[in-house]
């Protein structure tokens, strides 16, 4: 576990990982006696102090409301739970629990914006109208649409050629059809 | 720890063409919108073209229009910028930038034109 | 294209001073659907690559100290610095992110 926020309360990763692989598997060395191991702490608790002597056990508490660890472990305190940030729109997928972090997610039809790792937003998917959808809105990829003859695509989303200004890049796409299609009045572009 | 390394950079002449890199590392490349943002000597931040996540969104500064390409490679962790017919106007420091919000950066690739 | 205006282009600050950054937008920033603004603030200290402190106007970035402040809504934008340290000497640009193509503004010297 990556103990965040949690400075000073555990030796660093390299120590750790030294002292570490001098117990078996499930135990840690004693903080204070290098030959002692101890039994780590269960997912959902936290160490209160170390086994006094080996054989005998760690004493290891539940970890408080709104706290929790995901793994074996031997911190001094339990970890925060991440509070899912309603200014990026996100949403609860599942609560905190002692030895589960909270799971943040977005509703349907939105897609996932990443700013950080731990950190996006929830954004509507484009809903293609006046278009088809190419590529199906997926958890970190808006929709692509293909727009409809009289459309062109801007910012994801299909707007009408009347919206297209001289030189812009729109014109290309906005051109009237070659005079062979002009008998089908509806394929004809609103520019 | 987050990284963006670009390379590809150096001196080519007008006309030319030149391939910018951008190796990331630390974080997940595909869940990320991407830019290449560049930065001529002395002078202020121009953003430079746009890919989302899954390549489907694709932008460009008017500067560059038609001439240079962004592209991606999520298997590699990998972003392109091809630049072709290049011109004076395009020396600048070239840099990656990781996010819709431009949270990670490089540090950079010189090109001189 | 949205145009990026930046005030003022540079400005000598003594440590201790509380400083303001104006950046104009040609056109409205605010998002309708999401009700956010799509500015951000960047910090570019000599010889090395910009830094986000600012996004949605107003929202500090992890890790950005708290003395950085973010203001304003629409076409009008202010970054603050409270009490401004030595290590704040920088360049500082605004960025629209709210269409394509984004544009920077010019960018404010801090000396």
């Known amino acids: 576990i990556h103990p965040s926020g949690v400075t000073g309360l555990v030796p660093s990763l390299g120590d750790r990982e030294k002292r570490d692989s001098l117990c078996p598997q499930g135990k840690y060395v004693h903080s204070k006696n290098n030959s002692i191991c101890c039994t780590k702490c269960h997912k959902g608790t936290y160490l209160v102090s170390d086994c006094p002597s080996p054989g005998r056990d760690t004493v290891c508490r539940e970890c408080e409301k709104g706290t929790f660890t995901a793994s074996q472990n031997y911190l001094r305190q339990c970890l925060s739970c991440k509070t899912c940030r309603k200014e990026m729109s996100q949403v609860e997928i599942s609560p905190c629990q002692a030895d589960k972090d909270t799971v943040c997610g977005c509703k349907e039809n939105q897609f996932q914006r990443y700013l950080s790792e731990t950190h996006f937003q929830c954004v509507d998917c484009s809903p293609c109208f006046n278009g088809t959808v190419t590529i199906p809105c997926k958890e970190t990829q808006n929709t692509v649409c293909n727009c409809h003859a009289g459309f062109f695509l801007r910012e994801s989303e299909c707007v009408p050629c009347s919206h297209c200004k001289k030189n812009e890049e729109c014109m290309k796409l906005c051109l009237p059809p070659p005079l062979a299609n002009v008998t089908n009045p509806q394929d004809s572009g609103t520019a | 720890e987050v990284q963006l390394v670009e390379s590809g950079g150096g001196l080519v002449q007008t006309g030319k063409s030149l391939e910018l890199s951008c190796e990331a590392s630390g974080f997940t490349f595909s869940n990320y919108d991407m830019n290449w943002v560049r930065q001529a000597p002395g002078k202020g931040l121009e953003w430079v073209a746009y890919i989302s996540s899954g390549s489907g969104h694709i932008y460009y500064g008017d500067a560059v229009k038609g001439r240079f390409t962004i592209s991606r490679d999520n298997a590699k962790n990998l972003l392109f910028l091809q630049m072709n017919n290049l011109k004076s106007e395009d020396t600048a420091m070239y840099y990656c930038?990781?996010?819709?919000?431009?949270?990670?950066w490089g540090q950079g690739t010189l090109v001189t034109v | 294209d949205i145009v990026m205006s930046q005030s003022p282009s540079s400005l000598a600050v003594s440590a201790g001073e509380k400083v303001t950054i104006g950046c104009k937008s040609s056109q409205s920033l605010l998002n309708n659907k999401d009700q956010k603004n799509y500015l951000n603030w960047y910090q570019q200290k000599p010889g090395q690559s910009p830094k986000l402190l600012i996004f949605?106007?107003?929202t500090r970035h992890i890790g950005v100290p708290d003395r950085f402040m973010g203001s304003g809504s629409g076409t009008d934008f202010t970054l603050t610095i409270n009490s401004v340290q030595n290590e704040d000497l920088a360049d500082y640009y605004c960025?629209?992110?709210?269409?394509?193509?984004?544009?920077f503004g010019a960018g404010t010297k801090l000396e």
């Open positions: 960025l629209q992110t709210y269409s394509f193509p984004y544009t």
């Open positions: 949605f106007a107003s």
């Open positions: 930038s990781g996010s819709y919000w431009f949270a990670y």
